[in-house]
């Protein structure tokens, strides 16, 4: 898909650049996993709306495709979810982040991962030392990824006899027990996969490919970018202002994103002795809904009001807190008289055009 030139916003100065950022993160997920992609805005400035694009087509949020601030989650992933994902600024199509995602059949088994590389013809007639079959895929020697992402190093090779592959970390033999969460060695894929990387995974990773005729090696450097812990993020526009007819049902929604376990509460602003705030400036509120023994986060993200009365009108707040801090969004409920009264008003003096 050709996007032509586009404006890249860098420190508020526009420059013309190509359609893809230089960093393309390669991620592997297992079938049934949740694909999670994160894309914080460069410079942290206001970017306007964003859109996630897969293989050139815009992704619409659904039950399975969840979108939050700078974040995409695809639940219960399957082969069809493999592809090129980018997070773009909606208005200009500026590519903020780019990911290459592969969803494999058997995430836990070492040698039965299928895909395009399975078809590589690694059979060699003449005896000889190992050689790289896809050197163009090994250009990216420095990989910088956010913590909790999946990293995959590959060294596709061939030789006769078929060479073996082993891995070193910082020059020493690297095995699964050397890291929490272990590693996945996929010999047929000539790959090393580490899920949920942490800062201690930083270092130099070397693949050693050898047979009796010789040995070749390639070193990759991994940098793990620590997530800056933050208070919960609440989805823009939620909860939304609502207008309801007397006696009807209303739902307020609040979408919370938080690395640390969030605690969600729904509050209603009330007046005490004619005042909305206390002597210290804190608003008077009543807690309508909070976490209980049997309440799920999903249930807490919705506040349902049944058979609303005029007393229900007012300001409602979704308050979310975690170990780092609190965030809150508010919305107003306007309660209108029942429909019959409105019809009379309409007939009395409404002019319709269009």
């Amino acid at each position: 898909e050709s996007l032509g030139t586009e404006q890249r916003v860098v420190g508020r100065v526009a420059e013309v650049s190509g359609p893809e950022p230089s960093q393309q993160e390669q991620l592997v997920f297992g079938s049934g996993d949740a694909v999670e992609l994160s894309c914080p805005p460069p410079g942290g400035g206001p970017m306007g709306p964003t859109v996630w694009v897969k293989d050139g087509a815009g992704l619409v949020p659904s039950e399975r495709v969840l979108v939050g601030p700078q974040r995409l989650q695809v639940l219960n992933a399957s082969h069809e979810d493999s592809g090129a994902y980018s997070c773009r600024q909606r208005l200009t199509q500026l590519v903020l982040c780019h990911f290459s995602v592969r969803v494999t059949d058997a995430p836990s088994s070492g040698d039965d991962e299928d895909g395009e590389d399975e078809a590589e013809d690694t059979g060699v007639d003449t005896a000889g030392a190992p050689y790289w079959t896809r050197p163009e895929r090994m250009d990216k020697k420095l990989l910088a990824v956010p913590a909790a992402n999946t990293v995959r190093f590959r060294c596709p090779a061939a030789g006769n006899p078929t060479p073996s592959i082993s891995w070193l970390k910082n020059g020493k033999e690297f095995r699964g027990e050397h890291r929490i969460g272990g590693i996945k060695l996929r010999h047929q894929q000539w790959s090393l996969v580490m899920e949920s990387v942490v800062p201690s995974d930083r270092g130099n990773y070397t693949c050693v490919v050898e047979n009796k005729f010789g040995s070749i090696r390639q070193t990759y450097t991994l940098d793990v970018l620590e997530r800056s812990p933050h208070r919960p993020i609440l989805q823009a526009g939620l909860p939304a202002n609502q207008t309801a007819v007397l006696g009807s049902d209303v739902e307020f929604h609040c979408k919370v994103y938080s690395d640390a376990q969030p605690h969600i509460q729904w509050l209603k602003h009330v007046e005490v002795n004619g005042s909305k705030v206390g002597p210290d400036g804190t608003p008077y509120v009543t807690v309508l809904k909070t976490a209980g023994a049997n309440t799920t986060d999903k249930e807490l993200e919705v506040l349902s009001l049944h058979n609303v009365t005029f007393e229900d009108a007012g300001e409602y707040t979704c308050l979310a807190g975690n170990s780092i801090g609190f965030s809150h969004h508010s919305a107003w409920l306007v309660v209108l008289p029942a429909e019959e009264e409105l019809v009379e008003a309409d007939e009395a003096g409404s002019v319709y055009a269009g």
Partner: antibody
Framework: EVQLLESGGGLVQPGGSLRLSCAAS????????MSWVRQAPGKGLEWVSG????????YYADSVKGRFTISRDNSKNTLYLQMNSLRAEDTAVYYC??????????????WGQGTLVTVSS | QSVLTQPPSASGTPGQRVTISCSGS????????VSWYQQLPGTAPKLLIY???KRPSGVPDRFSGSKSGTSASLAISGLRSEDEADYYC???????????FGGGTKLTVL
Amino acid sequence: EVQLLESGGGLVQPGGSLRLSCAASGFTFSSYDMSWVRQAPGKGLEWVSGIYSGDGSIYYADSVKGRFTISRDNSKNTLYLQMNSLRAEDTAVYYCAKDGPMNEESRFDYWGQGTLVTVSS
Amino acid sequence: QSVLTQPPSASGTPGQRVTISCSGSSSNIGNNYVSWYQQLPGTAPKLLIYADSKRPSGVPDRFSGSKSGTSASLAISGLRSEDEADYYCASWDYSLSGYVFGGGTKLTVL
């Protein structure tokens, strides 16, 4: 053929409420960003609010923040604008506008014919 | 007072080339795309140009858009009587977190 048909306009007193609807057809409504744009009599265009499918975000012009609420019902292919605490300066023709595809640069490529909202006592 | 500044009027004779300017700032035109709309009397606006200079299908190539820094221009060559209309520029504004329109330019074909 893309069609956008606004309704719900009319005469309302200052402080009153109105709900505008925009019935969409001829395209996959849920996949497109939508906006409301208004035009006061004899004046220029003013963007009012936009609702973005790609990230669920909603934006409002400062002049209507806290009073107007944009929403959509994808099952009914309908865009709404709930207008509360209406003022005389909200008097305008309100247009519903469709944005271009999500994977292309933003622009209002289709517009409805508009519905007139008159706020007067 | 509009965030984007356009001349209130412009005029030309049939066959002439007319240019309409639109001036903004780094928070809108300088860091975002500009689109142009034509509004014939008594009708809804119609998209003429988007992404600074792209033309939707069906728009004659007599209409062209350009941009430099924080200013954009709409050029109409081979002016025709049916081009008599109001023309508006628009862009997203980062500091306002919303779209902004120019005040509009009334084009008269003499």
